[in-house]
């Protein structure tokens, strides 16, 4: 059984800090361990991952790590599975948020002597305590004109006056740590001497060497001052311009004009308004230089007539965002019709052959123009130049079947033979123009052939029947050397095929006629009783009208088939003695004898001193050893036939005679004693 040595336990954890849920397992076989969170398998990430059997957290996350963890151990071989106790985190965290206006509903409604309530959107666990600041100075609870409610995280000003104007921020702390507001609130209670925004500058994008204008206006009593600064805090005035802003002009109404803009002029411009009282107001606007990148290439497209297709033009990156349009034959495409532009797409509805050609996507902005062509081909259904014809092909020669078609794009041609796809191999070859070549025609190639020519627009097909004109040939060719058994009945077959059924006849090679006991029956030479005189050379002649004749020569030998006069017997020999395995065979031609021992032929020239094969065929083995035991086969063969017979040889230890046994006691089994 699977046993947990260490189980995960619930624990406190700090947001963003390390943690470890331990799990250790003991099992009889190898197990693999995985973790569940609320019943679903935990996927490894860089933040949370398996470390051995335990689950390691590089940075605890209060959202992703809330829930119940469980360690599961599985023996993959047996399928046994065990589950640990559940464990969860009590995650301590604090998270910054903005200071927002709670009352009144909008800044426009803030008037002197109204109540203003701000809320600090810092949250955490455990609940933090809050501290408020105005312009960085802490506000203590119970001070005149304001109250702090820690529970609601609110600061209330009653009544609010110009003296409360300022930047309000808050901080909060808990056992976990501290956080301050991510966005602060500027309270501006109307004071005529404070500068107020009338017109704020906007971001501008211009082409190189063009001009750019920023507008900026403030109002106050008495009138406020206005100053322009560039990124590096250099003031811009009509009297003192920085070196890279020689062509800058500040107008009396506060507008800033830049002429012949260069890349070094791009950046952030700040307009600062200062009233008699109150803080300065800083407004920012950015000057961007227009740019446009190159467009990606299009792949050529092949469409079919009658279909609807779209080609998307991805606009190049640029500032400002480039506008995109399509052209064909130098004419801009409309936004409706059969071939039109929709968004960045070229749309071709109910495609016609005439729609083929080059379409151009254009993109342009202040920085310039880019273009990219796409070549559109409209596929057509193939048409016939030459269909395959019913054909007569000669056996053994190459044969050709045409399948010539034309279309756009170039059609692909495949061939079928008896409804089976022909794959190119050593016998079949499909040329580029679609013609099929059969390299060496065989009889069974006579069947139906079908070619199919296809483009994306469709396909056409045609079939033709092939008739094979057979060669005049022997089927099979007679064996050139054959044996017949003396004094027995024998037959020698000869058959042939051709375009017309051939006639077959036998004759002796010397032209002499066949004896009366030898008959020629439809190509089979029949010997009623073989005599020595029947040996010799014979010719089989096959002929028909259109193809002439062919001849096959056969040499017939008359033989007395092999019989064994003496066969080897099952033999048991004492170790160290001599074994004799006798074998004698007769036949005509006189048979030769070979021995096979333990599955290998015994070569008389390599037998060594212990073994010898006599002239009469017997095998003798001297000083026999246990490893000589096994089956021995006597093989008798001549030019006409072969026969074999076998017997086992057993080599045994010589028994030690017991007291009771006399010297003349016979051995317990048949022995050769030497």
């Amino acid at each position: 059984a699977i046993v947990f040595i260490k189980q995960p336990s619930s624990q406190d954890a700090l947001q963003g800090r390390r943690a470890l849920l331990r799990c250790e397992v003991e099992a009889p076989g190898p197990v693999h361990v995985y973790w569940l969170l609320d019943g679903a398998p935990v996927q490894d990430t860089e933040r949370r991952f398996a470390q051995g059997s335990s689950l390691s957290f590089a940075a605890v996350d209060r959202l992703q790590d809330s829930g119940t963890f469980q360690c599961v151990a599985r023996d993959d071989v047996t399928g046994e599975e065990a589950r640990s106790a559940n464990a969860s985190f009590n995650i301590k965290w604090i998270e910054a948020g903005p200071v927002v206006l709670k009352h009144p509903a909008s800044e426009a409604e803030i008037q002197p002597q109204t109540q203003v309530t701000l809320r600090c959107h810092i949250d955490g666990h455990p609940r933090p305590t809050y501290q408020w600041f105005r312009d960085g100075t802490p506000l203590s609870d119970g001070q005149s004109n304001h109250t702090v409610s820690s529970k609601e995280r609110n600061l209330t000003l009653r009544p609010a006056g110009p003296e409360h104007s300022g930047l309000y921020s808050c901080c909060a702390h808990s056992a976990f740590g501290q956080a301050c507001s991510s966005q602060n609130f500027t309270l501006s209670i109307a004071d005529e001497s404070f500068a107020r925004v009338v017109l704020a500058p906007q971001d501008v994008v211009v082409a190189r060497y063009e001009e750019a204008m920023f507008h900026c206006q403030f109002s106050a009593q008495p009138p406020p001052s206005l100053q322009w600064l560039f990124e590096d805090e250099t003031p811009i005035t009509n009297r003192s311009r920085p070196p890279h802003l020689r062509r800058a002009t500040v107008f009396a109404n506060g507008s800033l004009l830049l002429t012949q803009v260069r890349p070094r002029n791009a950046g952030i411009y700040r307009c600062i308004g200062q009233g008699q009282r109150g803080p300065p107001i800083i407004l920012e606007a950015t000057l961007h230089l227009a740019e446009i990148e190159d467009m990606p290439l299009f792949e050529p497209r092949v469409f079919t007539a009658g279909s609807e297709e779209r080609v998307t033009c991805l606009p190049p990156k640029g500032l400002p965002e480039p506008s995109v349009w399509w052209e064909h034959a130098g004419v801009r495409l409309p936004t409706h019709g059969r071939v039109y532009q929709k968004g960045h797409e070229l749309v071709l509805a109910n495609i016609a052959e005439s729609d083929a050609g080059v379409y151009t996507c254009h993109a342009a902005n202040l920085a310039g123009q880019r273009r990219q062509d796409v070549n559109i081909t409209v596929a057509t259904v193939p048409s016939w130049l030459k269909k395959p014809q019913d054909s007569q092909l000669e056996e053994g020669k190459p044969g050709y079947l045409d399948c010539l078609t034309q279309a756009t794009p170039k059609p692909t041609v495949v061939w079928y033979r008896n409804q089976m796809l022909i794959s190119e191999d050593s016998r079949f070859e499909v040329f580029k123009n679609g013609t099929l070549r059969i390299n060496s025609v065989e009889v069974y190639d006579g069947t139906w052939y079908r070619c199919m020519s296809s483009t994306p627009a469709g396909s056409i097909e045609a079939q033709a029947r092939v008739q094979v004109l057979e060669k005049l040939k022997f089927t099979p060719p007679p064996q050139p050397q054959q044996c017949m058994e003396f004094d027995k009945e024998a037959t020698v077959p000869c058959s042939a095929t051709g375009r017309e059924k051939p006639t077959i006849k036998w004759e002796r090679a010397d032209g002499s006629s066949l004896p009366e006991w030898v008959t020629d029956n439809a190509g089979t030479l029949h010997f009623a009783r073989v005599t020595r005189d029947d040996a010799g050379n014979y010719t089989c002649i096959a002929s028909n009208g259109p193809q002439g004749q062919i001849r096959a020569h056969v040499q017939l030998t008359v033989a007395v088939f092999i019989t064994f006069k003496v066969e080897p017997e099952r033999t048991t020999v004492y170790q160290g003695h001599t074994a004799l395995l006798q074998c004698e065979a007769q036949g005509d031609p006189k048979p030769l004898i070979q021995w096979k021992g333990k599955d290998r032929i015994l070569d008389p020239t390599k037998l060594g001193p212990r073994m010898h094969i006599f002239q009469n065929g017997s095998l003798v083995i001297h000083d026999v050893a246990p490893e000589d035991s096994g089956r021995y086969t006597c093989i008798a063969g001549n030019s006409c036939n072969i026969k074999h017979t076998e017997a086992p040889l057993y080599v045994v230890d010589k028994p030690v005679p017991e007291e009771s046994e006399g010297p003349g006691s016979p051995p317990p089994y048949k022995m050769i004693q030497t």
Epitope: P30, H32, Y34, G39, P41, D76, G79, E81, A82, R83
Partner: antibody
Framework: EVQLVESGGGLVQPGGSLRLSCTAS????????MNWVRQAPGKGLEWVGI???????YYASWAKGRFTISRDTSKNTVYLQMNSLRAEDTAVYFC??????WGQGTLVTVSS | EIVMTQSPSTLSASVGDRVIITCQSS????????LAWYQQKPGKAPKLLIY???NLASGVPSRFSGSGSGAEFTLTISSLQPDDFATYYC??????????FGQGTKLTVL
């Protein structure tokens, strides 16, 4: 003796449903994971899904929605419910405990 | 979708040959080692040969061995025996209790 026996296979029409059973003996299902694996005629093995020791199920992407694995621990039996069957669902369906112990399989034929 | 690719799909060899079958996964298996090899003969259920990449299952001859890590694995038969002609499958286990088989390698007599 620990063994698994599948049953419930047979001929079903396309669009039809079938429920296969895998009855376990010699051990309790509640401590083991059980897999269903299928093999179309002349084709390779294809994992269908798994039910773990708690009864949670997980499936191959192609099996989600049509196939449902469940179990009845009192009967020590795991089930494979197959809906909207297609011709390509024709196969021998095996149940297996872990990697080692497999049933003999049951043939499902989907044909009209 | 996880794809496991075995190569070769078919393999002809002779008794005594050393045979290597490879298995490649489109993503890493769980723990980099959750991979098993099976042998299947016609009409029979698969038989487990190797689990956890390299551990020999009970009763499996030592001529079978496995190796690899992550997404690439091999099964080696050191000296092929007549009983080894069969189809072999790899099976990977993945994060999220998902498993997948290779398409199989048919080992036939040369």
């Amino acid at each position: 003796e620990v063994q698994l026996v599948e049953s419930g296979g047979g001929l079903v029409q396309p669009g039809g449903s079938l429920r296969l059973s895998c009855t376990a003996s010699g051990f309790s299902l509640s401590n083991y994971v059980m897999n269903w694996v299928r093999q179309a005629p002349g084709k390779g093995l294809e994992w269908v899904g798994i039910i773990d020791s708690s009864g949670s199920t997980y499936y191959a992407s192609w099996a989600k929605g049509r196939f449902t694995i469940s179990r009845d621990t009192s009967k020590n039996t795991v089930y494979l419910q197959m809906n909207s069957l297609r011709a390509e669902d024709t196969a021998v369906y095996f149940c297996a405990r872990g990697l080692y112990l497999w049933g003999q399989g049951t043939l499902v034929t989907v044909s009209s | 979708e996880i794809v496991m690719t075995q190569s070769p799909s078919t393999l002809s060899a002779s008794v005594g040959d050393r045979v290597i079958i490879t298995c490649q996964s489109s993503q890493s298996v769980y723990n980099n080692n959750l991979l098993a090899w099976y042998q299947q003969k016609p009409g029979k259920a698969p038989k487990l040969l190797i689990y956890h990449t390299s551990n020999l299952a009970s009763g499996v001859p030592s001529r079978f061995s496995g190796s690899g890590s992550g997404a690439e694995f091999t099964l080696t038969i050191s000296s092929l025996q007549p009983d080894d002609f069969a189809t072999y499958y790899c099976q990977g286990g993945y994060n999220g209790n998902i498993y997948a088989f290779g398409q199989g390698t048919k080992l036939t007599v040369l």
